[in-house]
């Protein structure tokens, strides 16, 4: 049978040939009658055999990390007969390891983030080196990790490569650290190979700083003319934290929040002081408010850093603005009777300068030829007024400061012209009528009505009468209907066209005003020749007939 021990060849042997071991048959008596042959992968190129003795040699430098075993076949032949002495057999040559590979960190670059102020023992990251040497061959691939740089803040577990915090760190002092870790094989014993890696450890922010005002006093100014909502200035607190932890909210302490407010600009982290209610220099020309600032997000466990909010004092000076005159009333309404003489008193308006210097005021009435106003604000008529032409005047009163003519105010002025009874009633239209020659007595020939241009406090009431002369002339009579109308009736039987073709009747119309006014109005009555049927008429004035729509021949 075959006789051999397990074959090992150390890697990286530089000799031209290295004896590995011997293959032999137990039938071989050493008289050189047998021939040994080597077959298979590496035979002749990597390994050779002494055909006489069966000694095997490696003739190439081997790398265990590349290939750690070779399977070859051995033959032994009787030289005399050429026959196989033993059956062909496989055997294995194992390449034994030497410590020729240093540990390597394959996952570089390493970067970790850990919250600032983390307690000792907090895990940061695990680094892992790998060693291509044989882990089952002694300590060639047994690694120990150590810290070359990073004390006293970090430590590394020697066997796992786990990096932990060994001392609290404040991001506001230093926000990143470079830690250098060394991995040594041979568990650090002499002859060990080593590799290093750098780990960038960044500290993430925690909210361990409250915002603080850098200024204990801010001085701001606001114009008294500023509308509500106006931004009058900014204040700023500083927070050493970053990001969300530096977001802050400004506010005004409760007692001071009537006139001003503070809103927060979350982009710039500034506090914007805004006007909440209009200010008046003449009423109050300075204010003092106390502002405070707090972080927007504070986890419960970090409240210890935020016990008392930082405050600052803001002095706000109100700037005086030359304000326009101020009328006592928003508008004025006056009454004046028509027909009052020129220069009659209408009313008084009053405006004052709201500013401290109290400038005298000048007044004017825009676009009016009817009224005047003097420097005291007294309004008088400059012309006689006729209510029947204009019953109301819508005017504008302007007040101007004497010392600054650009400061102007205007308000509406309404003047009502009151009625006096200065118009007598008169016919509501021109009346012209006719009477037939054959008309009987008491026949109604016309109804009349009147109008009065005056305004009546109560309803108008008109009284109708014939003039004295016409009363004596008994051809016609009038009846007052007591409803502001009257009827004219014939007072005789028969009229003669040739003798008296037309009558002019004077009618008196009086109103119920105080004093009462009367007018005389003429009614024209034509005498016409009316046919028996009443359809054919012949009058002195054909126009009358035509205009009245009667048929003529």
């Amino acid at each position: 049978g075959w006789v051999w021990n397990q074959f090992f060849v150390p890697e990286e042997m530089n000799t031209t040939s290295h004896h590995i071991g011997q293959l032999r048959s137990d039938l071989d008596n050493g008289n050189n009658s047998f021939q040994y042959k080597l077959l298979g992968a590496g035979a002749g190129s990597t390994f050779i055999i002494d055909e006489r003795t069966g000694d095997i040699y490696a003739i190439q430098k081997l790398d265990r990390e590349e290939r750690s075993l070779y399977i070859l076949r051995a033959q032994v032949i009787d030289i005399a007969t050429g026959r196989a002495v033993e059956p062909e057999s496989e055997f294995v040559i194992k390449v034994s390891d030497i410590n020729d590979n240093e540990p390597k960190f394959l996952d570089e670059p390493y970067e970790a983030i850990v919250p600032e102020m983390s307690p000792e023992g907090t895990l940061v990251i695990q680094v892992t080196a790998s060693d291509a040497d044989d882990p089952s061959s002694g300590n060639n691939a047994r690694l120990l990790y150590s810290l070359l740089q990073g004390q006293p803040y970090f430590s590394v577990e020697p066997t796992t490569g786990v990096i932990r915090i060994s001392s609290k760190m404040d991001r506001e002092l230093q926000d990143e650290y470079w830690v250098i870790i060394q991995a040594k094989d041979m568990i650090g014993q002499p002859g060990a190979l080593s590799g290093t890696t750098s780990v960038l450890i960044k500290l993430s922010d925690v909210n361990d700083n409250k915002p603080i005002f850098k200024e204990s006093l801010y001085r701001l100014t606001v114009s008294e003319s500023a509308p509500t909502g106006t931004s009058i200035g900014t204040i700023m607190a500083y927070d050493n934290d970053i990001g969300e932890n530096a977001e802050m909210d400004y506010s005004i302490e409760e007692d001071d929040s009537q006139t001003f407010d503070i809103i927060t600009n979350h982009e710039t982290q500034e506090g914007i002081v805004i006007l909440k209610k209009k200010v008046d220099f003449e009423h109050q020309n300075h204010y003092g408010i106390r502002a405070k600032v707090k972080n927007h997000h504070v986890p419960e466990q970090l409240m210890k850093y935020h016990t008392e909010a930082s405050t600052t004092f803001i002095k706000i000076q109100v700037e005086d603005v030359d304000e326009p005159p101020l009328f006592l009333l928003p508008y004025y309404v006056f009454e004046v009777f028509e027909e009052t003489p020129q220069g009659s008193f209408v009313g008084v308006v009053s405006a004052t300068d709201p500013d401290n210097r109290k400038s005298p005021i000048r007044y004017s009435i825009t676009r009016s030829k009817v009224f005047n106003i003097n420097d005291n604000g007294t309004i008088t008529t400059s012309n006689s007024l006729d209510r029947e032409i204009s019953a109301w005047y819508n005017l504008s009163i302007t007040a101007t400061e004497k010392y600054n003519i650009e400061q102007i105010s205007s308000i509406p002025l309404y003047v009502q012209v009151l009625n006096i009874n200065d118009h007598a009633p008169e016919f509501s239209q021109y009346y012209e009528t006719y009477v037939c020659e054959n008309a009987g007595s008491g026949q109604v020939i016309q109804t009349i009505s009147a109008v009065d241009r005056d305004e009546s406090i109560e309803e108008h009431h008109f009284y109708f009468n014939l003039s004295v002369e016409d009363t004596n002339n008994s051809s016609f009579t009038i009846i007052d209907n007591q409803d502001n109308t009257a009827v004219i009736l014939t007072n005789r039987t028969g009229f003669n066209l040739q003798e008296e073709p037309v009558f002019y009747i004077s009618i008196l119309i009086a109103d119920n005003g105080i004093p009462s006014l009367t007018s005389t109005n003429t009614l024209t009555i034509h005498v016409c020749d009316c046919g028996d049927s009443g359809s054919t008429q012949t009058c002195q004035y054909q126009e009358l007939v035509l205009s009245m729509g009667f048929k003529t021949e």
Partner: antibody
């Protein structure tokens, strides 16, 4: 798991050099115990081993192609490459890259392959 | 170099049948150095068997390998539709070589 991906031009002119790259993902080319190999397959034919390389740079080539083949490695990019010079139409094939177990010689895994046509 | 000869060139069988594929080496090959692959159209080869008889990860147990020296066999005990493909043997002697392949087609 380890994956391989071939890349390179699909058309090469006769007499020029064919160049392909194999990119390894899901593992390191620097792992011991493996060769990184190129194999080709002519259309409708069998498989032909071209050569392989260890990450140290040591190479082994098919004797029939040795004079025209160069395989190189770039551990920083986790890649290895094939150059085949003086190509002819007979080099038209699907080219595969694969990982080889250095002790026992089996090929696993393989790239999906890339067809290279040699034509003017 | 070691030449591997596969037979038959084509095997026509029906699903459910047993397939026996042969691979003969021109000289003795260590069984540790013999592997079998399956290749489907348009795909890369896939490792089935290594060390002559060990199944690769994820390979169904209907695939088995045997043999030593110069004669090796791949057996598919019961063909499934997805098993119809080309099969190659490969050795790892001085220089890796592949057999010419056996095509297993549906009868």
């Amino acid at each position: 798991q380890v994956q391989l991906q071939e890349s390179g031009p699909g058309l090469v002119k006769p007499s020029q050099t064919l160049s392909l790259t194999c990119t390894i993902s899901g593992g390191s080319i620097s792992s011991g115990g493996y060769y990184w190999s190129w194999i080709r397959q002519h259309p409708g034919k069998g498989l032909e081993w071209i050569g392989y390389i260890f990450y140290s740079g040591r190479t082994y080539y098919n004797p029939s192609l040795k004079s025209r083949v160069t395989i190189s490695v770039d551990t920083s990019k986790n890649q290895f490459s094939l150059k085949l010079t003086s190509v002819t139409a007979a080099d038209t094939a699907v080219y595969y890259c694969a990982r080889v177990n250095s002790n026992y010689g089996w090929f696993d895994p393989w790239g999906q392959g890339t067809l290279v046509t040699v034509s003017s | 170099e070691i030449v591997l000869t596969q037979s038959p060139g084509t095997l026509s069988l029906s699903p459910g049948e047993r397939a026996t594929l042969s691979c003969r080496a021109s000289q003795s090959v260590s069984s540790s150095y013999l592997a079998w692959y399956q290749q489907k159209p348009g795909q890369a080869p896939r490792l089935l068997i290594y060390g002559a008889s060990s199944r690769a990860t994820g390979i169904p147990d209907r695939f088995s390998g045997s043999g030593s020296g110069t004669d090796f066999t791949l057996t598919i005990s019961r063909l499934e539709p997805e098993d119809f493909a080309v099969y190659y043997c490969q050795q790892y002697g001085s220089s890796p070589t592949f057999g010419g392949g056996t095509k297993v087609e549906i009868k």
